[in-house]
């Protein structure tokens, strides 16, 4: 079932500036008398099909109007979607016999944007390198996920990671910083060498990726970062 | 290896507060995010919210705002979880659970019995 | 929120049969952020299956997972009575992080 009762209501994920469609299956065989559309309780929309002439459509709520439409099945379509269309849509399709009810929770979602490390990292006399890292990205709120990763293994659970790099012990070592959320995710390399390398002391600066084409980007004269970005 | 070793049993009345205590050895602390997990008793796995070690941010489930909060002993590697006007409801098993990188619950401690009880 | 159903709530099963359980989700989740649990009476929960298929450290090959979108399960070969337990699924990629209600495998 597309649509849901009002028990359950049918997630929907928006991404934001793009459309979304709530879908509505009509109940088999029977005539419909009309259709309210309603949005955290209150109306948006209230339609009136016709066999032979196209439908009366009447839009209730002037906010989000001129980005409202409608498909042949009267399922609701949002275009150029905003944060605040989030929240609670409900369809009442009315027959001669009965009401049916379809409930839906609208959730907009940012795409993924121009992800960061900074970089804090000391060179000790010892020439073991204790890098501290932070990633972000544009906007995060708390549906994104961050995690870094080096050879596959998961090395932090946070926008941060702290690790000692020995160049002496380990060889050539990339941390890579992954941003993931419902709808997209970014990742972003650094290497530990050439954060390192050869400076008794490094206040790094911050390198940063967009969401270009290039699968690598050198990102600094040291192509010290190299950046990937999913849908 | 790692592990999470929780504080022991609690009995404590309506309205009074406990504080529940998670050490972590094993990782780097501050790399892993800290999730509490509510399981009352014959029932199932609630997340209560998750505290980021690095930052000190804490984010909870709608549920547990208000009367819970998490905080941190970053020194000593430790995770809290405070309960206060304790309810006869706050009566379960706490654990504290580390935040994998997918945000699986990876590692746990053994659990921190709470009852309240006039 | 979103939620996890899990069927069935009860099962049993003698030694050396093949068990599935299912999770079904509200709103379509990435594969990598759908989890599996087990915890036996008196126990922590233990994490056995992440990120949909791989498994947990020490988890022995008669557990697998699987699924994509709103679909998850999760399959013992063949069982065995140290398998009795609680198992819970678990979404990690929408706040609030949810869990499923539990299946209860019980021995035939």
């Known amino acids: 079932d597309a649509s849901q009762s009002s028990l359950t209501p049918l997630m929907v994920n928006g991404i934001l500036g793009e459309s979304v469609t709530l879908p509505l299956e009509f109940p088999a065989g029977e005539k419909v008398n009309f259709i309210t559309w309603l949005f955290n309780e209150t109306s948006l929309a209230f339609i009136v099909p016709h066999e032979t002439k196209s439908p009366e459509i009447h839009v209730t709520n002037p906010k989000q109007g001129k980005r409202l439409n409608f498909t042949q099945s009267y399922s609701l379509q949002l275009s150029n979607l905003k944060m605040e269309d989030t929240g609670s849509y409900r369809a009442q399709i009315s027959t001669k016999t009965s009401a049916k009810l379809s409930s839906y929770t609208l959730r907009i979602l940012r795409q993924l944007r121009n992800i960061q490390v900074t970089n804090h990292s000391q060179l000790f006399q010892n020439m073991t390198c204790e890098l501290h890292l932070t990633c972000s990205v544009e906007d995060a709120d708390d549906n994104v996920s961050f995690r870094w990763e080096a050879l596959g293994n998961t090395l932090s659970s946070q926008p941060n990671l702290t690790v000692s790099w020995d160049p002496r012990i380990s060889s050539e070592q990339d941390y890579t910083c992954i941003a993931e959320n419902a709808v997209s995710n970014l990742s972003f390399s650094v290497s530990a060498q050439k954060l390192c390398g050869g400076r008794s002391s490094l206040e790094g600066p911050r390198f940063e990726g967009k969401p270009i084409p290039n699968p690598l980007l050198g990102l600094d004269s040291t192509r010290t970062g190299h950046h990937h970005h999913h849908h | 290896q790692i592990q999470l070793v929780q504080s022991g049993p609690e009995l404590k009345k309506p309205g009074e507060t406990v504080k529940i205590s998670c050490k972590a050895s094993g990782y780097t602390f501050t790399n892993f995010g800290m999730n509490w997990v509510k399981q009352a008793p014959g029932k199932g796995l609630k997340w209560m919210g998750w505290?980021?070690?690095?930052?000190?941010?804490?984010t909870y489930a709608d549920d547990f705002k208000g009367r819970f909060a998490f905080s941190l002993e970053t020194s000593a590697s430790t995770a809290f979880l405070q309960i206060s006007n304790l309810k006869n409801e706050d009566t379960a098993t706490y654990f504290c659970?580390?935040?994998?990188?997918?945000?699986?619950?990876?590692?746990w401690g053994q659990g921190t019995p709470l009852t309240v009880s006039s | 929120e979103i939620v996890l159903t899990q069927s069935p709530t009860t099962v049993a099963a003698s030694p050396g049969e093949k068990i599935t359980i299912t999770c079904s989700a509200s709103s379509s989740i990435s594969s990598n952020f759908l989890h599996w649990y087990q915890q036996k009476p008196g126990f922590s929960p233990k994490l056995l299956i992440y990120r949909t298929s791989k498994l947990a450290s020490g988890v022995p090959g008669r557990f697998s997972g699987s699924g994509s979108g709103t679909s998850y399960s999760l399959t013992i070969g063949t069982m065995e009575a140290e398998d009795v337990a609680t198992y819970y699924c678990q979404q990690g990629i929408y706040m609030p992080l949810t869990v499923g209600a539990g299946t209860k495998l019980e021995l035939k």
């Open positions: 505290i980021n070690t690095y930052s000190g941010e804490a």
């Open positions: 659970a580390r935040r994998g990188g997918t945000a699986e619950f990876d590692y």
